[in-house]
């Protein structure tokens, strides 16, 4: 016979049930009733064989990240509460989680919190008006880099080809240019725009499309048409890595991306 409610515990892990969509952050709070002189706080996931797999730890005012940097532990100002977050949760992150405290000498012992369940659901397709959300996962940084570099090269080649075609079609054009269309009208994304991967390229956000937009019609016959590279509206701040956006949105920050949940 098991009790319907949980016993009082020196460790609590909440919420008991958490549901997030894939790509969203999942955050649990591990709370200690009080802080012993020295302790280690571990974050565990329960394996299918009911064993505890350590995800990350906190010891001696120091965070000890696990192998997967998506699992982050942050100590809150009151000292007794710890945020335990999964950044950009994946479908296979669904499962049972708990925190455990090891109290070091003189009274060495181990306490485990009650368990909590995380459910990561598939991302539902949202109307384009809604805010963008991160893609479920990348197949690998290397693949992203290759695709990105290739897309940039293809784009540059297409622009050169376009310039050459225009020069051949309008050989008499000498000077002047005309911007057709409103300046503040944003560049519209077609439904078949492919996702773009985060690249360590410095300050620029490169947009890549499978279909090259057709050249705008010239306003007057005797004018040269200049090819224009369109950059996204938000300028990249100096020293910050620019990440290419996509239909599903930008990648979540990685631990080295700045403060986030990771303590300095």
């Amino acid at each position: 016979l098991d009790s319907p409610d949980r016993p009082w515990s020196p460790l609590t892990f909440s919420p008991a049930q958490l549901t997030v969509q894939e790509g969203e952050n999942a955050t649990f709070t591990c709370s200690l009733a009080d802080i012993p002189d020295s302790f280690v706080l571990n974050w565990y996931r329960l394996s299918p064989r009911n064993q505890t797999d350590k995800l990350a730890a906190f010891q001696e005012d120091r965070i000890e990240p696990g192998r997967d940097r998506r699992f982050r532990v942050t100590r809150l100002p009151n000292g007794r509460d710890f945020h335990m977050s999964i950044v950009a949760a994946r479908l296979n992150d669904s499962g049972i989680y708990l925190c455990g405290a090891i109290y070091l000498p003189p009274n060495t012992q181990i306490n485990e919190s009650p368990r909590a369940e995380l459910s990561v659901t598939e991302r539902t397709l949202e109307p384009p008006t809604q805010s963008p959300s991160p893609p479920p996962r990348l197949s690998g940084q290397l693949q992203g880099l290759v695709i990105g570099v290739t897309s940039v090269l293809v784009g540059v080649l297409l622009l050169l080809l376009l310039t050459w075609v225009l020069a051949a079609v309008f050989p008499r054009a000498t000077r002047g240019a005309c911007v057709c269309g409103s300046e503040d009208e944003p560049l519209k994304e077609g439904p078949d725009a492919a996702p773009v991967f985060t690249l360590d390229y410095g300050e620029l956000d490169f947009q890549w499309r499978e279909k090259t937009p057709e050249p705008p019609a010239p306003c007057a016959p005797e004018q040269t048409e200049y090819a224009t590279i369109v950059f996204p509206g938000r300028p990249a701040s100096p020293g910050r890595r620019a990440s290419a956006s996509s239909l599903q949105g930008a990648q979540p920050p990685s631990p080295e991306d700045g403060p986030g949940l990771w303590p300095p």
Epitope: W8, S9, R80, Q109, N111
Partner: antibody
Framework: EVQLVETGGGLVQPGRSLKLSCVAS????????MTWTRQAPGKGLEWVAS????????YYPDSVKGRFTISRDNAQNTLYLQMNSLRSEDTATYYC?????????????WGPGTMVTVSS | DIVMTQTPSSQAVSAGEKVTMSCKSS????????????LAWYQQKPGQSPKLLIY???TRESGVPDRFIGSGSGTDFTLTISSVQAEDLAVYYC?????????FGSGTKLEIK
């Protein structure tokens, strides 16, 4: 050797206040959770108040909540119980107890107790 | 609140006999996640303060003779003294620490014939 010694008991009139003390020795006081438990004459044991190691969390039954306050001075290895608005049903021997298994409220060590009599 | 009921309220046995006493809780003290029962047993000899005998329903406190055996799970618990000695004359209390408020049973008084 673990020792807990309670002091401060005595005869007090209903409605008045009394403060009990418990001096601990033989263990690292500031690492352990402490509790006051009482026993009315010829009766059973009743839990009165509990406090965690740094004093950040305290717990009381409804019978004393708002009237009794548990506190501790870790520098002095001392546990306190401030009892206000005393009633005749508070008459009992008050035991200071330690929970050496960090975070679980069963009591490894008990002091000899101090008698509190509430009577007019 | 979790109510603890102890039976019998008193019993008299001869030295060397086996004795059992019962403690029932109004709700289960077993927590499935750690498979532990949040129950302790104390012994209080005449004129003395209580002493911890058993915790987690069956774990004997260090220094406690092995004739004291705690058993049971969920809501039904038993303290057994396999061979009663004269010095076992005392009142025995069970206590739940599953949840606040912490509660004790009313006690079982053991008398020696």
């Amino acid at each position: 050797e673990v020792q807990l010694v309670e002091t401060g008991g005595g005869l007090v009139q209903p409605g008045r206040s009394l403060k009990l003390s418990c001096v601990a020795s033989g263990f690292t006081f500031n690492n352990y959770w402490m509790t006051w438990t009482r026993q009315a004459p010829g009766k059973g044991l009743e839990w009165v108040a509990s406090i965690t190691n740094s004093g950040v969390s305290t717990y009381y039954p409804d019978s004393v909540k708002g009237r009794f306050t548990i506190s501790r001075d870790n520098a002095q290895n001392t546990l306190y119980l401030q009892m206000n608005s005393l009633r005749s049903e508070d008459t009992a021997t008050y035991y200071c107890t330690s929970a050496l298994n960090w975070g679980y409220w069963y009591f490894d060590f008990w002091g000899p107790g101090t008698m509190v009599t509430v009577s007019s | 609140d979790i109510v603890m009921t102890q039976t019998p309220s008193s019993q008299a046995v001869s030295a060397g006999e086996k004795v059992t006493m019962s403690c029932k809780s109004s709700q289960s003290l077993l927590y499935s996640e750690n498979k532990k029962n949040y129950l302790a047993w104390y012994q209080q000899k005449p004129g003395q303060s209580p002493k911890l005998l058993i915790y987690w329903a069956s774990t004997r406190e260090s220094g406690v003779p092995d004739r004291f055996i705690g058993s049971g799970s969920g809501t039904d618990f038993t303290l057994t003294i396999s061979s009663v000695q004269a010095e076992d004359l005392a009142v025995y209390y069970c206590q739940q620490y599953y949840n606040f408020p912490l509660t004790f049973g009313s006690g079982t008084k053991l008398e020696i014939k």
